[in-house]
């Protein structure tokens, strides 16, 4: 039987990683996972990843969605796998924008 797991530091979660900051990895490990969507030069840029240090995500995750950026955060292994951040446009798309996944 595996022994007890004392909490000597904050819990870490496995997160899906998609985007330029991920390098060759498709996952990362951190204290929070995130899924984000931003508009860059008319493109919808989707990214996923993790905040390794809780404070990194504290402000980002509390920022309400704006027409140009939305971030959703979660805590749990692979919790950002099925999360797609949505811009607050109630189903309308911005003219001249297209979807783009940063790989």
């Amino acid at each position: 039987m595996e022994d007890e797991k004392p909490k000597v530091n904050p819990k870490l979660y496995m997160c899906v990683c998609e985007g330029l900051s991920c390098g060759n990895e498709d996952h990362c490990e951190g204290q929070q996972c995130f899924s984000s969507l931003s508009i860059n030069d008319g493109f919808h840029v989707y990214q996923k990843g993790c905040f390794q240090v809780y404070e990194q995500g504290k402000m980002t995750c509390k920022t309400p969605p704006s027409p140009g950026q939305a971030v959703e955060c979660c805590q749990g292994d692979w919790c950002n796998r099925n999360i797609t951040a949505q811009l607050p446009t109630k189903g309308k798309s911005f003219p001249g924008t297209q979807n783009f996944h940063l790989e």
């Epitope: 022994d3 004392p6 909490k7 530091n9 904050p10 996952h27 240090v53 809780y54």
Partner: antibody, heavy 114, light 113 residues
């Protein structure tokens, strides 16, 4: 039972390199993050480096950043620390430790001296 | 970077008598998740450290109840109610709040008078 056995320590000249290994057994290695922690002779403990369960995330103390590289091979249940540009102040016993620091190896001594 | 300062550096005690070690942090160790990641470790001569207590006051299974941890924020204490011969060695406090940058106190040597 959980076992961690370090190896690779020894005497090396300043500027030289050394590769430490830690062989793990008695638990599912890939389920745990691992750390290297060192202790200079007669001194206290200093955290050196950390690697996540899959090896995708690595962290280093400022004192070793750019000189040390941590890696792991989950298929072989092994943890490694590649040390280069070694300095006299890197002289220490190097311990590998398993999350959450309740299991430590006996340590391997690294001496950097000309 | 969080700095942990331990006092005293050395604590000579009589067998059966209590001992107390203090650990002061340069900043609060309360994490955003509400927990305080302050642990205590014990190292006997020639051996690796052994984790005794985590999140201020939780004893690891197998650790005798003569060991107790207390404190909050930046000030923490490890108490041994009745020191036994096997308790000699160096005690370290450690913070994990700023993980992965773990930091340790300088250590307190407990020896028998």
């Amino acid at each position: 039972q959980v076992q961690l056995v370090e190896s690779g320590g020894g005497l090396v000249k300043p500027g030289g390199s050394l590769r430490l290994s830690c062989a793990a057994s008695g638990f599912t290695f890939s389920d745990y993050y691992m750390s290297w922690i060192r202790q200079a002779p007669g001194k206290g403990l200093e955290w050196v480096s950390y690697i996540s369960r899959t090896g995708s995330t690595k962290y280093y103390a400022d004192s070793v950043k750019g000189r040390f590289t941590i890696s792991r091979d989950n298929a072989k249940n092994s943890l490694n620390l590649q040390m280069s540009s070694l300095r006299a102040e890197d002289t220490a016993v190097y311990f590998c430790a398993r999350e959450p620091l309740q299991h430590w190896g006996q340590g391997t001594l690294v001496t950097v001296s000309s | 970077k969080i700095v942990l300062t331990q006092t005293p550096l050395s604590s000579p005690v009589t067998l059966g008598q209590p001992a107390s070690i203090s650990c002061r942090s340069s900043q609060s160790l309360v994490h955003s998740d509400g927990d305080t990641y302050l642990s205590w470790l014990h190292q006997r001569p020639g051996q690796p450290p052994r984790l005794l207590i985590y999140t201020i006051s939780n004893r690891l299974s197998g650790v005798p109840d003569r060991f107790s941890g207390s404190g909050a924020g930046t000030d923490f204490t490890l108490k041994i109610s009745r020191v036994e011969a096997e308790d000699v060695g160096v005690y370290y406090c450690m913070q994990g709040t700023q993980f992965p940058a773990l930091t340790f106190g300088g250590g307190t040597k407990v020896e028998i008078k």
